[in-house]
């Protein structure tokens, strides 16, 4: 088909030779008034760059991608010729960086439903260059982690060395969808939830006297739980004395809260102190009684078949420990009066 009528967009991918990174192209189809295929709701031009990623609800996967060989050969179907490039719906994913990805990429609807659709195509001229300037030693990574339950931010790698004041207007996408309210080089997340993970794309425009182009970077964001910095705390028993009836059975429960750790080896045990002697008691297995994002509560009981006079002279100690440290809580039994 004739690509001379396609709208054209120039993009620059500057990749870091130090790290693995991916890149994406959206099928930014234009919006001729008469084309039902390309028609979609758009925000006002003030809010949005020249084109939006194609988001027609029924047509998400109904686009065809081609590469235009530099030698003037016919267009090549991406799926047949380039194993490191994957089409996912209307997005083209480049799995590995390299200057060999430079070239012209064309997308258009698979189904041409009307004569107007013939021109419903977009040509993206992609230039790929390795990052050369060492001036920005600490540029943001293309893989960024956010700590669940805390405040975090996602930085645009190609702009992370610029202050917010100097930074140009940035257009952000998350999993292919425009984040219309985000316009700076950093997205601030007040409280991180797992739905904040995904593929983020940041675009900004650069120009010289001749032309302008879009500088794009892709960030893979993961949400992770941070390891606790606290030793466990004992929630029960709270009191250090317990009223009991002699000759009756007794169960004392120790409930301890352990902060999340990726390598989780909680210790919870009972031991008895009697004058100078100390020994660990064989008690039923510990069991988890509550599990939340940031911690786990584990319970272990000590069971006395019948409380004796000797037990009143002893201290029953619950000992809990994680990789940070340990805590103990002792209980002295006291005979109930009356």
């Amino acid at each position: 088909f004739n690509i001379s009528g396609c709208s054209t967009k120039k993009l620059l991918w500057t990749y870091s030779t130090r790290s693995e990174e991916e890149f994406v192209l959206f099928c930014d189809l234009p919006e001729p008034q008469k084309s039902h295929f390309c028609h979609r709701n758009r925000l006002s031009p003030k809010q949005v760059p020249e084109h939006l990623p194609f988001m027609g609800s029924n047509d998400l996967s109904d686009v065809q991608w081609y590469q235009q060989p530099s030698n003037g050969d016919p267009l090549e179907d991406i799926r047949k010729s380039y194993p490191h490039i994957i089409q996912d719906k209307c997005t083209l994913h480049f799995l590995t960086p390299g200057v060999n990805n430079s070239g012209s990429y064309i997308c258009r609807p698979k189904m041409i439903k009307s004569p107007y659709d013939v021109a419903c195509c977009v040509k993206m001229i992609l230039e790929v260059k390795p990052q050369t300037n060492a001036s920005c030693e600490y540029s943001a990574s293309h893989k960024q982690d956010l700590l669940l339950g805390s405040t975090g931010s996602i930085s645009c790698p190609s702009l992370s060395c610029q202050s917010d004041a100097q930074s140009p207007a940035v257009t952000w996408y998350k999993n292919g969808k425009l984040l219309s309210v985000e316009r700076s080089n950093r997205i601030v997340v007040d409280e991180v939830y797992d739905y904040h993970q995904g593929t983020y794309v940041c675009d900004y425009t650069q120009s010289d006297t001749v032309s302008s182009w879009t500088v794009r970077a892709v960030v893979q964001v993961r949400t992770i739980v941070g390891d606790t910095k606290l030793k466990p705390d004992i929630l029960d028993p709270v009191e250090d004395t317990l009223e009991v009836e002699l000759g009756k059975p007794l169960t004392i429960s120790c409930k301890a809260r352990f902060g999340f750790e990726r390598v989780f080896n909680p210790v919870i045990k009972w031991y008895i102190k009697d004058s100078d002697l100390e020994w660990e008691v064989s008690v039923p297995e510990a069991k988890s009684i509550k599990s939340t994002l940031k911690d786990e509560i584990i319970e272990r009981n000590i069971i006395l078949e019948k409380v004796t006079q000797r037990d009143l002279r002893r201290k029953f100690v619950c000992f809990v420990q994680n990789s940070i440290g340990n805590t103990t809580q002792s209980v002295q039994l006291k005979e109930k009066r009356g």
Epitope: Y193, D194, D236, K290, S291, L293, E296, E299
Partner: antibody
Framework: SLEESGGRLVTPGTPLTLTCTVS????????MGWVRQAPGKGLEYIGY????NTYYANWAKGRFTISKTSTTVDLKITSPTTEDTATYFC?????????????WGPGTLVTVSS | AAVLTQTPSPVSAAVGGTVSISCQSS????????LSWFQQKPGQPPKLLIY???TLASGVPSRFKGSGSGTQFTLTISDVQCDDAATYYC???????????FGGGTEVVVK
């Protein structure tokens, strides 16, 4: 999103497994719970699963089993009785607890009758 | 097991008025505040309104307010709208999750 399936008419004593299919969210760090509602009645908390551990309401112990894969959370009704006739909802607590269920499936109806 | 007792149903409210629903727990709630409030309309799943006893869930209008601590909690709806007609449930979380339970529900009728 969450979607329950597997609800149907069963005879008393016939085990039944309900499946909650999850898309677009990670199951590893947050509680995924099951709640039920008998026709015309209130909500009942069955239990939840988090980091592979399962927790059941006292009344539900032994009557239900919760398990999960990377994209589904199952609820097995071990030996249904007519009292188990209800709409069963799966829900997710994105706030890090076991009680603030902010994501819900539409529910699936289980009818136990002889 | 813990028991959560809610204001008996139904509770009437006038459009533009204020309505309060109480929820009392037989045991102390975990962290004193692990209690949530849900709104449910017929044929729909419940919708989270409040968690942590007083924190508004995402997208919930500020007309909904949760208060209380320990064993006594209240949901207050101010400037009541017709759309607020529904059944409201509290859900308590305890140190031992096996005690977790819903309250019996309170139906709010808007006149």
């Amino acid at each position: 999103s969450l979607e329950e399936s597997g609800g149907r008419l069963v005879t008393p004593g016939t085990p039944l497994t309900l499946t909650c299919t999850v898309s677009g969210i990670d199951l590893s760090s947050y509680a995924m719970g099951w709640v039920r509602q008998a026709p015309g009645k209130g909500l009942e908390y069955i239990g939840y699963i988090n980091r592979g551990n399962t927790y059941y309401a006292n009344w539900a112990k032994g009557r239900f089993t919760i398990s999960k894969t990377s994209t589904t959370v199952d609820l097995k009704i071990t030996s249904p009785t007519t009292e188990d006739t209800a709409t069963y909802f799966c829900a997710r607590d994105s706030y890090g607890g076991d009680y603030a269920f902010n994501l819900w499936g539409p529910g699936t109806l289980v009818t136990v009758s002889s | 097991a813990a028991v959560l007792t809610q204001t008996p149903s139904p509770v009437s409210a006038a459009v533009g008025g204020t309505v309060s629903i109480s929820c009392q727990s037989s045991k102390t709630i975990y962290n004193d505040n692990w209690l949530s409030w849900f709104q449910q309309k017929p044929g729909q799943p419940p919708k989270l309104l409040i968690y942590g006893a007083s924190t508004l869930a995402s997208g919930v209008p500020s007309r909904f307010k949760g208060s209380g601590s320990g064993t006594q909690f209240t949901l207050t709806i101010s400037d009541v709208q017709c759309d607020d007609a529904a059944t409201y449930y509290c859900l308590g979380s305890y140190i031992n999750s096996s005690d977790n339970a819903f309250g019996g529900g309170t139906e709010v009728v808007v006149k």
